[in-house]
């Protein structure tokens, strides 16, 4: 979201972003950069919360209308405040942190904000494994963390566009914090000398895990990208 | 003066279950994280997990989920650590450490005196 | 899970300075990894030294001060003194985690 605001409007850009809850997160906030960090105001809002989110200005934090859910896990990166970066860092992301916020700056040459929309969730990415155990050649496929539930798929470079539904089975089992999920996936019947793929995906993120099998070795490659986080 | 007080030297046999406290004082409690940190000889630090007693926010090292809990009772301003099914690997000084997460500060700069457990039948 | 690796021990003389530096198996340390460098002395007695790489807490001297090097977290002590033999621990925090190094002991002669 881009954001101008006031007779002497500066721009304010933000990036629609996603939180992995437990770990840090950021939500991104750029603005034009003042020549004096003591002139520059950052204040951190969120939709439907009465307090500030993070304020930070004449250099340091001010955090005495700071909202309880958010003391403790909030902070700017205050050597990059001067070249224009107001992006809040946010400690162990919640659950309840999704929302709408709001980056409203103030310098010496004027005032502006932008909204973004910040998800929450969980995603993690998958490996996958020969199932050594099985009867027949089988791959599984593990991802520690999902929220929400998501969908799982399988593919093959030789068999594309193939239904592997039938054939795989996939379940969900509640982490101990109840709420993330550990994400199991079996796949039966499987042929070397193929690349097989196991993809995750919620409406946070999505997740690959390929694996290669040949007589010889076996190859594995995975890779996670998180959804909608857009720039505008 | 911000201080951490932790509770007394404990005995305790395998199998059962021990309470650690820190006391904190001199600051605002609830707003301060509050790191466990588990010492054996030769073993160096490992951290155990965290806790935000202002909301109850915890976070544990996955090798210490089903070992330990922590809570915190902010109208006495102490924080606690339970450790469960202990064994002689339990055996250790634990301590707590205040974790201040800030801007232009973030660090641990406040650390308890220790709790030294010893699991023996 | 990460490993962090100190130096395991140095020797140093008072009014030298002295740099201990802590490696992540992961890559480069950054200022993301929050770098704390923790002091130990006898009797369970321990000190934040620096926090966020090179934020000092009310109280430390001047001569201890953080930063990166190369790729590396590094403590230096400039004008060490006789009381700074101790153990000195770093800690960096891997998004949701922290790491504490083997520890590095720190003697001064004289």
């Known amino acids: 979201d881009i954001g101008i605001s006031g007779r002497h409007s500066i721009t304010v850009t933000t990036v629609a972003s996603a939180g992995n809850i437990g770990e840090d997160g950021i939500l991104s906030c750029t603005f034009e950069p003042d020549i004096k960090l003591s002139d520059i105001v950052i204040q951190w809002l969120k939709e439907g919360v009465l307090g500030l989110v993070h304020e930070f200005k004449e250099g340091k934090d001010e955090l005495s209308e700071q909202d309880e859910m958010f003391r403790g896990r909030t902070a700017v990166f205050a050597d990059q405040v001067i070249v224009g970066n107001a992006s809040l860092r946010l400690k162990n992301v919640q659950l309840t942190d999704a929302g709408t916020y709001k980056c409203y700056i103030i310098t010496s040459k004027g005032k502006g904000n932008a909204n973004l929309e910040y998800k929450t969730g969980a995603f993690s990415m998958p490996e996958v494994n020969v199932d050594y155990n099985a009867s027949s050649e089988t791959l599984r496929c593990e991802a520690p963390r999902w929220f929400p539930q998501p969908t799982v798929v399988w593919a093959s470079q030789v068999d594309q566009g193939a239904n592997f539904s039938e054939v795989s089975n996939t379940s969900f089992e509640l982490n101990s914090e109840n709420v993330t999920m550990k994400v199991v996936s079996v796949l039966y019947n499987v042929t070397i000398n193929n690349t097989y793929s196991c993809m995750i995906e919620n409406d946070i993120a999505k997740a690959t895990g390929d694996i290669k099998v040949t007589e010889s070795e076996i190859k594995r490659r995975s890779h996670l990208q998180l959804l909608n986080s857009k720039a505008s | 003066q911000v201080q951490l007080q932790q509770s007394g030297a404990e005995l305790m046999k395998p199998g059962a279950s021990v309470k650690i406290s820190c006391k904190a004082t001199g600051y605002t409690f609830s707003s301060y994280w509050i790191e466990w940190v588990k010492q054996r000889p030769g073993h160096g630090l490992e951290w155990i997990g965290e806790i935000l007693p202002g909301s109850g926010i915890t976070k544990y090292n996955e090798k210490f989920k089903t070992k330990a809990t922590f809570t915190a009772d902010t109208s006495s301003n102490t924080a606690y650590m339970q450790l469960s099914s202990l064994t002689s690997e339990d055996s250790a000084v634990y301590y707590c450490?205040?974790?201040?997460?800030?801007?232009?500060?973030?660090?641990?700069?406040?650390w308890g005196q220790g709790t030294t457990l010893t699991v023996s039948s | 899970q990460a490993v962090v690796t100190q130096e395991s021990a140095l020797t140093t003389s008072p009014g030298e300075t002295v740099t201990l530096t802590c490696r992540s198996s992961t890559g480069a340390v950054t200022t993301s990894n929050y770098a704390n460098w923790v002091q130990e002395k006898p009797d369970h007695l321990f000190t934040g030294l620096i926090g966020g790489t090179d934020n000092r807490p009310p109280g430390v001297p001047a001569r201890f001060s953080g930063s990166l090097i190369g790729d590396k977290a590094a403590l230096t002590i400039t004008g060490t003194q006789t009381e700074d033999e101790a153990i000195y621990f770093c800690?960096?925090?891997?998004?949701?985690?922290?790491?504490f190094g083997g520890g590095t002991k720190l003697t001064v002669l004289g």
């Open positions: 800690a960096l925090w891997y998004s949701n985690h922290w790491v």
């Open positions: 450490a205040r974790y201040y997460f800030g801007s232009v500060n973030f660090y641990f700069d406040c």
